[in-house]
Each structure stands twice: as C-alpha cells, then as structure tokens.
C-alpha cells in the first residue's frame, strides 16, 4: 500500500499587503494516526503558523470544517498579511507518539510572497 | 454497510495465550485506524490498543503482552494476547476509527464482540 | 492521563421525560468528546461525535452540549428504546482513549 503523502499544490502564493493567503495542502490517508501542524520556515528555528490542538492563532483559519469527519484538506487561512509574513510554510504530518508527536512527512512548501499595498 | 466480526475469543488458563481476529468489511479498511476496546463483566469500556499503518498503541494493563497488527489484503485486524491474567476476562470488541478536528479519533462501527474467559 | 466522571450513575427517568447526563473531564479537552449507547448484549453505538454532532441516523431528541471539560447528553423525550447505558470517551489527548464510567438510564 502507498505512504501518506503530503501535497502542497502550489509552490508559491502573491498575495497583497492586507489581503488573505490561502495556503493549500491535502493528505493522501488518515494514517498514520497523528495531527498536521503549519510551520514557517525549516529546521530547529521554524515558526508554528497553526496546531489545531494548543495555542492560539488569532489570524489563521482552516479552510474546511473543523467537525468534517475524516478530513484530509489540512489547508488554511491566514488574515490581514504584511510583508513580515513572507516566508515559506510547510504541511507538516505528525505521527502519534507518547508523550510526544513525531514528525513523519513535510509538504514541498509553499513560498508566500507579499505585494505591498499601493500608495 | 461496514461489518465488523471479531472471533477467535474462549477460555484460557493464566499465562496462556488467544488471537482474536476482526474481519471488516463495506468500507475501505486499509484506510482507517482500528482499535480493540474491551468490557469486562458488568464494568465499563476500556481502550486496549489501536492501530494505523504501522503505528500501534497500547494501554498500560496490556503493554508488552498483547500485539495488535493488521493484514490489508485480508482486511482483517488482530490481536495477539500473551501471558494472560484473570483480569484480562472480558468482551473484546474491534471497532473503526473516525477522525475530526484534524487528529484524535472515536469509534464510528464496533462489531459484536467476542468473550475471553481467563480461568484456570 | 485524562479521566472522564460520568454522573449520576444511574439516571430513573418515566417515559417521555428529559434526561440530562453529565461527563465531566479531569483536564480541558476542547470538544474532541464522543456519546455512546449500550443496551444489554450488544455492542456500544456512536450517538454523538465532537461534543454536539449527532451521528448519522440518530434521532434529533439526543443532543450534546458543552466543551472544556464539562458535558452534557440531553435526550429530550425518553423512548422506551432508550433505556441503556451511555458512555463518554474523549480523544483530545491520547494515548489512552478514555471512557467514562457510564450512565445507566432505567425506566422509573
């Protein structure tokens, strides 16, 4: 049987100063059991964008329903972009682990790029 | 229609080992995580374990006695109980994993059940 | 581990009446919450998923409610089929999977 993949569509992403980013990425299977989380950026000093489970997210939101069963469409929303929002952000699959989720497979990314509001 | 059949449960003597064994079948069985979840007599449900692909996951009271594993080109799950104890007694029932919120899951189909007696 | 306090215990409710149980959680586990039904003999059935999800082809007179870590099961006008034993089980924070203690709801 085939691995869980996970797909990020679209390599990069323009998105105007004070706009929404759409940042897209699916999952192939439900398992691994385990969650999906947004990063920014890679390795040790990677910023979390989005972990449904803790924290608090004020300017993302998830495109599908959070109570949708069986879900595989892990993309999300992010508010009111800056450019200091501009970066690469990663899907990444985690498998559950005790005490703690390891990761299992990253998305390719996709690079968000800021245009700045016309003065 | 999603069935589930568990069989394979009896009487055993302490130290003493089974394999139930849950055939599935009306949904894509590969595709979802399964879980034993048992019942001893007159109590309540406890999870046992739980498997996706090649994640597993146990209770405590079972850790490193029991081994749950899957054959997808069976769409059959099992469960290998070793070293048996009186408490092990109950009603083992598969179930199908549901998942919502991104992770975490609950049982949306059970099958019936299958008795183990652990008695000498 | 996360533990679930099913209260009462056992629930006397007349035909037609409410019958409202409760699962408490020992730690918050947002609404990541499921209900289960058991009648004698038989195996346990999904009623409700995500606090407040009815599972498909249960009856609207069951409801949930609640998040954190307290929940309630309401089933508005109690049919003689619903006579049985329900469960919570959360799936916020696992492994393990934990389950309630259970509510019986027997005829008064």
């Known amino acids: 049987e085939e691995e869980l993949q996970v797909i990020q569509p679209d390599k990069s992403v323009l998105v105007a100063a004070g706009e929404t980013a759409t940042l897209r990425c699916t999952a192939t299977s439900l398992i691994p059991v385990g969650p999906i989380q947004w990063f920014r950026g890679a390795g040790p000093g990677r910023e979390l964008i989005y972990n449904q489970k803790e924290g608090h997210f004020p300017r993302v939101t998830t495109v599908s329903d959070l109570t949708k069963r069986n879900n595989m469409d892990f993309s999300i929303r992010i508010g009111n972009i800056t450019p200091a929002d501009a970066g690469t952000y990663y899907c990444v699959k985690f498998r559950k682990g005790s005490p703690d989720d390891v990761e299992f497979k990253s998305g390719a990314g996709t690079e968000l790029s800021v245009r700045a509001k016309p003065s | 229609e999603v069935q589930l059949l568990e069989s394979g449960g009896g009487v055993v003597q302490p130290g003493g080992s089974l394999r139930l064994s849950c055939a599935a079948s009306?949904?894509?069985?590969?595709?979802?995580?399964m879980t034993w979840v048992r019942q001893a007599p007159g109590k309540g449900l406890e999870w046992v374990s739980t498997?996706?692909?090649?994640?597993?996951y146990y209770a405590d009271s079972v850790k490193g006695r029991f081994t749950i594993s899957r054959d997808n080109s069976k769409n059959t799950l099992y469960l290998q109980m070793n070293s048996l104890r009186a408490e092990d007694t109950a009603v083992y029932y598969c179930?199908?994993?549901?998942?919502?919120?991104?992770?975490?899951?609950?049982?949306?189909?059970w099958g019936q059940g299958t008795l183990v007696t652990v008695s000498s | 581990e996360i533990v679930l306090t099913q209260s009462p215990a056992t629930l006397s409710v007349s035909p037609g009446e409410r019958a409202t149980l409760s699962c408490r959680a020992s730690?918050?586990?947002?609404?990541?919450l499921a209900w289960y039904q058991q009648k004698p003999g038989q195996a346990p059935r999904l009623l409700i998923y995500?606090?407040?999800i009815r599972e498909t082809g249960i009856p609207a007179r069951f409801s949930g409610s609640g998040s954190g870590t307290e929940f309630t099961l309401t089933i508005s006008s109690l049919q003689s089929e619903d006579f049985a034993v329900y469960y919570c089980?959360?799936?916020?924070?696992?492994?393990?999977?934990?389950f309630g203690g259970g509510t019986k709801v027997e005829i008064k």
């Open positions: 730690q918050n586990v947002k609404n990541d």
């Open positions: 179930a199908k994993d549901s998942t919502v919120s991104w992770s975490g899951d609950f049982f949306d189909y």
């Open positions: 498997i996706g692909s090649g994640d597993t």
């Open positions: 089980q959360q799936y916020y924070d696992w492994p393990p999977f934990t």
């Open positions: 009306g949904f894509s069985f590969s595709n979802f995580a």
């Open positions: 995500a606090a407040r």
